[in-house]
Structure formats: C-alpha cells, structure tokens
C-alpha cells in the first residue's frame, strides 16, 4: 500500500516566492521620473521575475526631522496621488504582485522614528495601517525598529491590527542589528511577524561561517517562517564581490523562507561603479541610457536589457531560481538539513514528502574543491542518493540535466550548484 | 469648508442615557480620527474618547471607560457619543473635534458643541 | 496622566499690548504642545499646534514657544477680536489633556 501523503502547511503568499523592495521610486525609474504611475509601467517586468510582492517606498509626506510635517496618510505629490496609488494597487493584484507599503516615519530624517515623543507616533501609525489596509494594501514595512523604544510591545500592537483585518496581511520590520539575541527578543512577541536584518551581512566569505549564522538561526528560531536577505534596505554589492553575487542568490532562494531583495540586487546593481550615486539607491540600470552622468560607464551587460538577453546572466539565474522556488514543494515548505560537505562548503538538502528533493552545495571559496558530502549527517527520511540532475550550476559550462556522481562532486571557485534527485521509498 | 454640527443634547436624569451626533462635512470623513471633548460649567476642557477614521482604535477617558461607546457611520459622515449610567458630573457642553493626519497631533477643527444637563 | 498647568487664569491688558501666556507640563512633552482660542459664546479654534507651528487662517500676531516642560503663547498685538479664553493641550501620550485655561480680558 502506498504511503500516506504528509498533509500540505497552510501557506501564505509571501511563504510563495520572494519580495521585491523599490526604497527610492526615482531611483528606479531613472531618467527623473520616479512616481507611482511610472512604476505601474515596471509592473511587467516585476512580473517577469516572478516575485510575489512588492515592498515600497516610504511614500508619504515627510519633511526632514519635522513631525509636525510628516503625515503617514498623504503621499508625497513628487509620488502621485492617491488615485494613482489606487491604480497600482489594482495593477499590481492583476498580476498577483503583492504590495507591501514602508511606513518608517521619518525616512529623510535622521532618526527613522524621530527623537521625540514615541508614543504619539506609534498611535499614528496604527491609524495609519487601519486607514492604508483599507485602500487595499497587503501589508506593511517598518524600518530601523532598534530606534524604536519598546519596539516590540510596538510590533505586537500594529501586528494585531493588520492580523485583526486578515490573516493574509503582512507586517515586515527591518533592523540594522546583526546579533542574535536583539533579533529573538524582537521575534518573541510577535508570532507571524517578517524580520529582515543585518544577520547574514556579515557572514564573510567561508562556508563554514556560513552554514552556522544559518543554522544557528534556523534552531533558534524553531518552526518559525523566516525571511533571508543581507540588510533591511540595502544591495547585496554592498556587502558581497561580484564573484559571490551567484552563490547568495542560490542560496537566498533556497533556504527556508522568504528571500527578500532589493531592486537591482537581480542584475548585480553596484554603487561603486556608478560615480557620484548614492550607496543606498543608486540608479536603476535599465539599458545603458539610464547612467548618462559619465559616457561609456555602463555596457549592456550591467543592464536589464544586456542581461534579458543573456541566458548566462545574474538576472537569468534569478529568474530560473525565482521560477523553481515558487513552484517546487521541497522548496515552498520542504524540511532543511544542513551537512558536512568539507572545509569552505555549505551544504543541505531540501525535501517534502515524496516530492523531488533538491541538493544545494556552495563553494565560498576563490579555489575549486571536491566536495566530500557526509551523507551520515542526515536522517534517515533525508538520505543522499549516488546520483543527482544537474538544474543549475552558477557558473557557465556545465551541462544542465546531467546525472552527477556526488562522491566525485567538484566545485569551480565560488560555484554553487542545484541538484535535483527523486524521491526513494 | 470644514464643518462639525453636534446634536442630542438636552435634559436627562441620574442614570440615564443619550446618544450625541456629530454631522461632519468639507472633508473626506472616513481618512480623518475623531475626538469627543467636554467642558463642565465655568470648568476647563476635558477629553472624552477618540475614534479612528476605520473604528479600528478606539480610544476613552477613564472617567467615562464602560459608560460611553464612541462610534462612527462614515457613509452618513456621522460620528456618535451614546451615554449611559448618566452622572450628574456628566454635565457638560460636548464638542466633537476633527484629529488632523500629521504625526503633530491636534483637534485641528471643532463643532460649536451640544449641551448636556444630568439632572433629577 | 500627564499634569497641564496655566497658573494664570486670567489676565488683563490693553489694546496693542504684547501678551504672553504660559502652561506648564508635569513631565517632557516633547514639544507636542497646542494652543486653542474659546471666544466667550464658545466656540473653539485651534491656533498653533507642536509648539510654534500657526494653524492655517491664524493671524500672524499668534506665536508660540517653549520646549520640555514649559511653554508659551504670544499674541504680539492686542487686539479686540482676541477677547477669549486660551487652553493649552499636550499631544504626546494618551489621555490627552488641556491645561485650565487662561481668560484675556480689556483693560
């Protein structure tokens, strides 16, 4: 008789795929445009990435340090309109893009919270989730919650009123603390809550370190749904080389819970490549137009448009691992297990049920190694096979489908690779 | 032009009970908080209760928690006091006042108020 | 609760004199400080709120100040149509609460 199908998690939409935040809407948009009507144009090519949703802004009127000028309710007419927000919304929903509006106070300002009087801005702000979950949005972001006294008795209060209006809206907060426990006292309270953090940041360039911040996390946060990114707000380039770029990707999209990017992080956007922008929302590069400051500063391959056209890509590899982890069992909700693969590797296995499993192994390293997989490592109900399909290799040149002997797994410097293997009674 | 109306006042006894409204217009009624403010004869102002432009965050003075139920239609642009278990301290001209939007808070528009007498 | 105190309740001066009023707060307000105007048949108005900032429609003879605990409302100007009844108000922390009240009358 065959055996029982293990019965299926309730899944939320943000369980489903990643998100995608645009922080500085003229900054994406480029060319000095940069308001909601314009992003409702980029609607597609969200869509083409296959992220669930959409995390944006902050919107609204905020003048520098001034609360007497900030008003959570309005958005900044450089933005739009509320008529035009509406419009972005109903787009969005066509498309099954999520919208996820930040709400930090004071974004222009020093202090993301001001450095008055805590009480009255966190009143607002519940008025302000009541007034925007009615107008339709599906959540919310808060940011730089370490300058929030009392943040967490904070979170579970807007948690209740965006759970209280359905239980498929979202509350993000983001924090700049890369520690463990302030991140744990911050989650303790609030169950359903996303954090992003700077907790990977600083995860270096071993595997080894690697796999225990992940590790040590996944325990600690027991059954929990995490989210994966390396900061609340800023690029992957600024923390990672360019050679590294592949091998997060690979594994944002493959552990689990919600990989969470910031726009550009899918073409490798960098900052320092492009003089005279800022750090933390350089000009979106969509075609080699879009940085006109400097003649020749940017080539196609830095490009949305250069890289569409490359199957060889950053942003083709995120698109096929954007696709692969929406769709795959083993990768939406599958169990984790972390193994021994040798010095300079991190390496798991993801797997649900009788579903197809996948085989992540990463080589942080700059010196290709054999990867000694110590199967042992794993339960029973998560054993290695002999073989397994090649999906995806980060790096060009091998050939996708083929069986690869896991004894004899060799990595290329910096080389992550997706396998794939069935499911064996 | 923002203009707050209240009504319902009038004479009650000890223990009884009265429903104030206030008829909002000039703005988009159902974006905005809302406040209920009193003033006992030859006294200062005092604050009531405070109703969210959604109702979600509901807001009273301890002197009248479990006694008076704020509440709001927003398609009739009405906002409402209903009092009950009525006490002589109760006495007073009821002003509904608009919160504005910006984080600055304040009653930033008033009703000409409604007067209340609890009397035997 | 937070404690709004106006230890003048009332007040008299002249046409064209500068008034100042003050209200003080039993803890750090934070400069969430407001300043309404009730005429003698009882409406209220709203003149400046978080401390200095003049309400839309306010005549510029209205200013205020102050920081922490203390603050100030300031007509430079006396004039007749200023014949009222002055609150202050914190906007820091619920309950929200007035101070008692300081009634300018005419020489």
């Known amino acids: 008789r065959a055996p029982r199908c293990r019965e299926l998690p309730a899944q939320k939409w943000w369980h489903t795929g990643a998100l995608y935040r645009i922080g500085d809407l003229q900054a994406f948009q480029g060319h000095g445009a940069g308001n909601l009507a314009g992003l409702k144009g980029r609607l597609d090519y969200l869509s083409s990435l296959k992220v669930k949703g959409l995390v944006l802004g902050p919107i609204h009127k905020n003048q520098k340090d001034d609360v007497a000028q900030t008003d959570l309710l309005q958005i900044d007419p450089n933005f739009g309109s509320k008529e035009d927000f509406d419009s972005l919304l109903q787009s969005a929903k066509k498309k099954s893009i999520r919208v996820i509006l930040d709400l930090t106070p004071n974004y222009r300002g020093e202090n993301s919270w001001f450095s008055t009087q805590v009480d009255t801005v966190a009143t607002k702000v519940k008025d302000a989730l009541e007034f925007w979950l009615q107008a339709g949005v599906d959540g919310f972001q808060v940011r730089d919650i370490e300058n929030l006294k009392d943040a967490s008795s904070f979170l579970a209060e807007w948690q209740n009123i965006t759970k209280g209006f359905s239980e498929d809206r979202l509350l993000i907060a983001g924090t700049n603390s890369s520690d463990l426990q302030q991140i744990l006292s911050l989650l303790e309270s609030n169950k359903d809550l996303l954090l992003t953090s700077s907790y990977l940041s600083d995860s270096g360039s071993t595997g080894e370190h690697t796999k225990s911040l992940v590790t040590q996390y996944l325990n600690a946060t027991g059954n929990r749904w995490c989210s994966w990114s390396l900061s609340q707000a800023r690029l992957l380039t600024s923390f990672l080389p360019a050679q590294l770029l592949r091998l997060y990707q690979l594994m944002l999209f493959t552990l689990p819970g919600t990989p969470v990017f910031s726009y550009g992080d899918e073409i490798g956007l960098d900052a320092a490549a492009l003089p005279g922008q800022p750090m933390e929302a350089p000009v979106m590069l969509w075609d080699e137009s879009s940085f006109p400051d400097i003649p020749g500063a940017v080539s196609a391959n830095m490009t949305v448009k250069g890289q569409s056209e490359d199957p060889g890509s950053l942003l083709s590899l995120f698109r096929r691992l954007s696709d692969q982890r929406s769709k795959e069992r083993s990768l939406l909700h599958g169990d984790f297990h972390a193994f021994s693969a040798g010095p300079g590797l991190f390496s798991y296995i993801r797997h649900w049920d009788q579903n197809e499993r996948f085989l992540v192994v990463l080589n942080f390293g700059d010196v290709g190694l054999s990867a000694g997989l110590q199967a042992s490592d794993l339960p029973a109900s998560a054993s290695l096979p002999a073989k397994a399909d090649l999906l995806l290799s980060t790096q060009p040149g091998r050939e996708e489908g083929s069986p690869l002997e896991l004894e004899r797994l060799k990595l290329e410097p910096h080389e992550g690779l997706l396998l794939r293997f069935p499911y064996a009674a | 032009d923002v203009q707050l109306v209240e009504s319902g006042g009038g004479l009650v006894q000890p223990g009884g009970s009265r429903k104030l409204s206030c008829a909002a217009s000039?703005?988009?009624?159902?974006?905005?908080?809302m406040h209920w403010v009193r003033q006992a004869p030859e006294k200062g102002l005092e604050w009531v209760a405070y109703?969210?432009?959604?109702?979600?965050?509901?807001y009273y003075a301890d002197t009248v928690k479990g006694r008076f139920t704020i509440s709001r239609d927003n398609p009739k642009n009405t906002l409402f006091l209903q009092m009950t278990s009525l006490r002589s301290e109760d006495t007073a001209m009821y002003y509904c006042?608009?919160?504005?939007?910006?984080?600055?808070?304040?009653?930033?528009?008033w009703g000409q108020g409604t007067t209340l007498t609890v009397s035997s | 609760d937070i404690q709004m105190t106006q230890t003048t309740s009332s007040l008299s001066a002249s046409l064209g004199d500068r008034v100042t009023i003050s209200c003080r707060a039993s803890?750090?307000?934070?400069?969430?400080l407001n300043w309404y105007q009730q005429k003698p048949d009882g409406t209220v108005k709203l003149l400046i709120y978080?401390?200095?900032r003049l309400h839309s429609g306010v005549p510029s003879r209205f200013s205020g100040s102050g920081s922490g605990t203390d603050y100030s409302l300031t007509i430079s100007n006396l004039e007749q149509e200023d014949i009222a009844t002055y609150f202050c108000?914190?906007?820091?922390?619920?309950?929200?609460?007035f101070g008692g009240g300081t009634k300018l009358e005419i020489k």
């Open positions: 006042a608009r919160e504005t939007t910006l984080l600055a808070t304040n009653f930033d528009y």
């Open positions: 000039g703005f988009t009624f159902s974006t905005f908080g």
């Open positions: 109703i969210s432009g959604g109702s979600t965050n509901i």
């Open positions: 803890q750090d307000i934070s400069n969430y």
């Open positions: 978080y401390t200095s």
């Open positions: 108000q914190q906007g820091s922390t619920l309950p929200r609460t």
